[in-house]
């Protein structure tokens, strides 16, 4: 094949090599960019900056090599459009630093930075940690800081991410209240901070106030939906990012719902209870306290992480006619109480007939299959009941 006269020449099926001295000063308009998986750049003294726009359209890029060039600065978001990048070689350039944000979100198997005049500072604490933890092939490079010795020996006692303290009201919060949260940020070299409120949706009206080092957040006219929702304060400095999440407990009275008994490996009377704080529960059977046992007991389903409502069953493992009757669930918390009742019929009473009456003879085909002598339990018939929601 004839030698390629261009600044950048194809290499394999999806690679590009740019090695002609001084031919590039940016990576705009590379030929076939959208399909490139490998880009090799060498001897480009004029290529000094790598920014977000440079790698736009290189979504398939896996391997990027820029070596023996003039690279001085890589923007923190430079690789935003190359999420598949797994090998990054920036050796023998003019890099003094590289932000932790640059590699955040990438799954780099290899990061090569040897031969750069790195300047030891807290901004390289993340790289020092990679070296300590054996990540990305960094330890083998024995990275040096220009005129300061090995990166591994850089003092790091003062290199911490921001410290966050979120103040939440310690008094009870009721539906309709306004709540003020304050996030206090401490640390060196603070760059950015803010709130993450993605979980809040319609739980409150949100107003942000203030800035570093003290961020305010007012949640106005809160609803009970605010419970179990994370409100997150975040802050960043040159070392990294810190986040602290808090939840605001909004008090509201107990409520309860009961549903018709269903057979689920024995029987279940399904219920839902809600309230903040979580209500205490008590069952009544025909008006009397039902003492729970290993054969009649309350069983909760796994709770959803972001809601207060709890679903469960009153489990009746072997109910017979003696368990037929009226079941009431009482739920109470300091803000109110609620109850719901349901009639449940699990099995007909085999002894329920008048001795004076002729003994009924059933010709129902259901009975012909019953050979064990057990009472016939018609499992296809739904027990009658009513569903009541209170609260």
């Amino acid at each position: 094949a004839a030698p390629c006269p261009d600044a950048c020449c194809p290499h394999g099926s999806s690679g590009l090599r740019c090695t002609r001295d001084g031919a590039l000063d940016s990576l705009h308009h590379l030929p076939g960019a959208e399909n490139l998986t490998e880009l090799y750049i060498e001897n480009q003294q004029h290529l000094q900056h790598l920014e977000l726009r440079d790698l736009r359209g290189l979504g398939e890029l896996r391997n990027l090599t820029i070596v023996k060039s003039g690279l001085r600065f890589v923007a923190p978001d430079a690789f935003h459009f190359t999420p598949r990048l797994s090998r990054l070689n920036l050796s023998f350039n003019a890099l003094e630093s590289l932000s932790w944000k640059t590699v955040q979100g990438l799954s780099l198997q290899e990061l090569v930075l040897s031969g750069n005049p790195l300047h030891c500072s807290c901004a390289l604490r993340w790289l020092q940690r990679w070296e300590e933890e054996g990540l990305g092939g960094v330890p083998e490079q024995k990275l040096q800081c220009h005129g300061q010795g090995p990166l591994a020996h850089m003092p790091n006692a003062s290199c911490g991410v921001p410290t966050l303290k979120v103040q939440v009201p310690n008094a009870s919060v009721d539906v309709g209240d306004d709540v003020l949260l304050r996030c206090q940020v401490e640390g060196r070299g603070l760059e950015q901070a803010g709130w993450i409120l993605t979980e809040l949706e319609q739980s409150a009206t949100v107003m942000k106030s203030g800035g570093l080092p003290s961020l305010g957040l007012t949640l106005a006219n809160v609803t009970s939906d605010l419970n179990r929702k994370n409100v997150t304060c975040w802050a960043e400095n040159d070392v990294g990012r810190a986040e602290v999440s808090v939840q605001v407990n909004v008090s509201f009275p107990a409520s309860v719902q009961l549903h018709t008994a269903v057979e689920m490996h024995h029987w279940c009377i399904p219920f839902s209870v809600d309230g903040q704080p979580a209500p205490s529960l008590r069952w009544l059977f025909n008006g009397s306290v039902l003492n729970e046992t290993s054969f009649i007991f309350t069983e909760f389903l796994e709770p959803a992480a972001n809601e207060t409502v709890r679903h469960g069953c009153l489990r009746l493992n072997q109910p017979t006619h003696v368990n037929n009757g009226n079941y009431t669930l009482l739920a109470a918390n300091p803000f109110g109480q609620a109850s719901a009742s349901i009639m449940a019929a699990f099995m007909d009473n085999p002894f329920e007939f008048n001795p004076e009456d002729p003994i009924p003879v059933s010709f129902s085909p259901v009975d012909t299959n019953s050979t064990s002598g057990d009472p016939v339990e018609k499992k296809d018939e739904t027990p009658f009941g009513v569903s009541v929601a209170v609260g």
Partner: antibody
Framework: QVQLVQSGAEVKKPGSSVKVSCKSS????????MHWVRQAPGQGLEWIGE????????NYNEKFKNRATLTVDISTSTAYMELSSLRSEDTAVYYC??????????WGQGTTVTVSS | DVQLTQSPSSLSASVGDRVTITCSAS?????MHWYQQKPGKAPKRWIY???KLASGVPSRFSGSGSGTDYTLTISSLQPEDFATYFC?????????FGQGTRLEIK
Amino acid sequence: QVQLVQSGAEVKKPGSSVKVSCKSSGYTFTNYWMHWVRQAPGQGLEWIGEIYPNNGRVNYNEKFKNRATLTVDISTSTAYMELSSLRSEDTAVYYCARSRYDPMEDWGQGTTVTVSS
Amino acid sequence: DVQLTQSPSSLSASVGDRVTITCSASSSVGYMHWYQQKPGKAPKRWIYDTSKLASGVPSRFSGSGSGTDYTLTISSLQPEDFATYFCQQWSSIPLTFGQGTRLEIK
């Protein structure tokens, strides 16, 4: 697989107490009731009580109500049965057994408690 | 308390025999459960909910009954079936067991 592993044999003096442990593995400890059953030499099975780790609910056989104490440690998935004021007739093998929707599905290997002066 | 009375207390039988053990409750129980125990071992759940065989229990075993009277039947006795069998009620506190039926080789 489900395992209930009980503590080793004990020899106790009359009037003293014994605490038998039952360590669970292979299932979600809090979802199952734990029963305690004893069997005197050459005799039948006698139910002592049951406990639900999920909420600490305990039911005792009236016969043991004042002497038996059932507890659980959820952090270690372990159930305990303590029997106080021991007498010679408490000499028996003590078993733990778990149940959820069906009775006593799995049993521990048993712990022999001998009460002798 | 619900008293459970098993009969017979002990039974000598030969391999291949059909054997029936009964359990009578002092008051009605919804279901009966049966356990097998061999010397020096913990009991094993054998039949539950009156007629369901526990995992690994051979089909020669069966259970039946209702109200106060329940039976465990072995259709054709095998050498490994010689053991003690206990019935148990799980319908009221305290849970109670029958006194046991010892099945031995004739």
